[in-house]
């Protein structure tokens, strides 16, 4: 996991600076509020389970 | 680093009930959701609750096996979650983790606590 | 409920060998993009730990000798070159609705 500002997160993953942390863009099916999903350049996500 | 520690379990009679305990820490746990999952020789591995974030308005899901005996809750003050099992059987006999999950994956597991439903 | 068939439930590996483990879901668990399927590693007296996540991704720490692939229904853990701590049990797990549901387990022996 990189701190911000150094090597992006790896690919798949994009930075949550609420968790200080890369973070899956897969789970952004289930949590698309997450700061994260912003740097998610996927499609946008299938509707959820639930 | 991160830890889950569970406390709890034990052997109770049928139709008796029981509350398990999980402390957290070593990460954010007010962000992540927390789940309880068992394993029995029988039935595997057996996802049983979920509890998600505020976020989320703390929603709660079960197994069908275990809605209306079963209540999942927490404490992010504390990092504490729990699970309160009401109405016990000898199915519900096994090893039960507490696991926490940002959204899919079960990522930190605790050591596990023996359930034993037996008269 | 989705159904997780991992097969087969038992192998014996020789030492250095590859190991596949399949696990078949009832249904797709998959979009165009990610597949929501996870595999773990159990050894006796402990919780089972994160392997792969979403089909393909290695868990940080877990060693490049495991590898996931797969996507629909159909998916596959391999290990290769097998070594002697690799000795478990190794469980599939969907995400993809609640209930979430994991197969029936792997166990392997190395030779």
């Known amino acids: 996991e990189q701190a911000p500002g150094t090597a992006p997160c790896s690919r798949g993953s994009s930075w949550s600076a609420d968790l200080d942390k890369c973070m899956d863009c897969a789970s952004c099916r289930a949590r698309p509020a997450s700061d994260f999903c912003l740097g998610c350049a996927a499609a946008p996500p299938a509707p959820f389970r639930l | 680093q991160v830890q889950l520690q569970q406390s709890g379990g034990g052997l109770v009679q049928p139709g008796g009930s029981m509350k398990l305990s999980c402390i957290a820490s070593?990460?954010?746990?007010?962000?992540?959701?927390m789940s309880w999952v068992r394993q029995s020789p029988e039935k595997g591995l057996e996802w049983v609750a979920e509890?998600?974030?505020?976020?989320?308005?703390?929603?709660?899901h079960y197994a069908e096996s275990v809605k209306g005996k079963f209540t999942i809750s927490r404490d992010d003050s504390k990092s504490r979650f729990f699970l309160q099992m009401n109405n016990l059987r000898a199915e519900d006999t096994g090893i039960y983790y507490c696991?926490?999950?940002?959204?899919?994956?079960?990522?930190?597991w605790g050591q596990g606590t023996d359930l034993t439903v037996s008269s | 409920d989705i159904v997780m068939t991992q097969t087969p439930a038992s192998l014996a590996v020789s030492l250095g060998q590859r190991a596949t483990i399949s696990c078949r879901a009832s249904?797709?668990?998959?979009?165009?993009?990610?597949?929501?399927m996870h595999w773990y590693q159990q050894k006796p007296g402990q919780p089972p730990k994160l392997l792969i996540k979403?089909?393909?991704s290695l868990e940080s720490g877990v060693p490049a000798r495991f590898s996931g692939s797969g996507s629909g229904t159909d998916f596959t853990l391999n290990i290769h070159p097998v070594e002697e701590d690799d000795t478990a049990t190794y469980y599939c797990?969907?995400?993809?609705?609640?209930?979430?549901?994991f197969g029936g387990g792997t166990k392997l022996e190395i030779k």
């Open positions: 509890i998600r974030s505020k976020s989320d308005n703390y929603a709660t």
């Open positions: 070593g990460f954010t746990f007010s962000s992540y959701w």
């Open positions: 696991s926490s999950t940002y959204a899919d994956y079960f990522h930190y």
């Open positions: 797990q969907h995400s993809w609705e609640i209930p979430y549901t």
């Open positions: 979403y089909a393909s």
């Open positions: 249904q797709s668990v998959s979009t165009s993009t990610y597949s929501y």
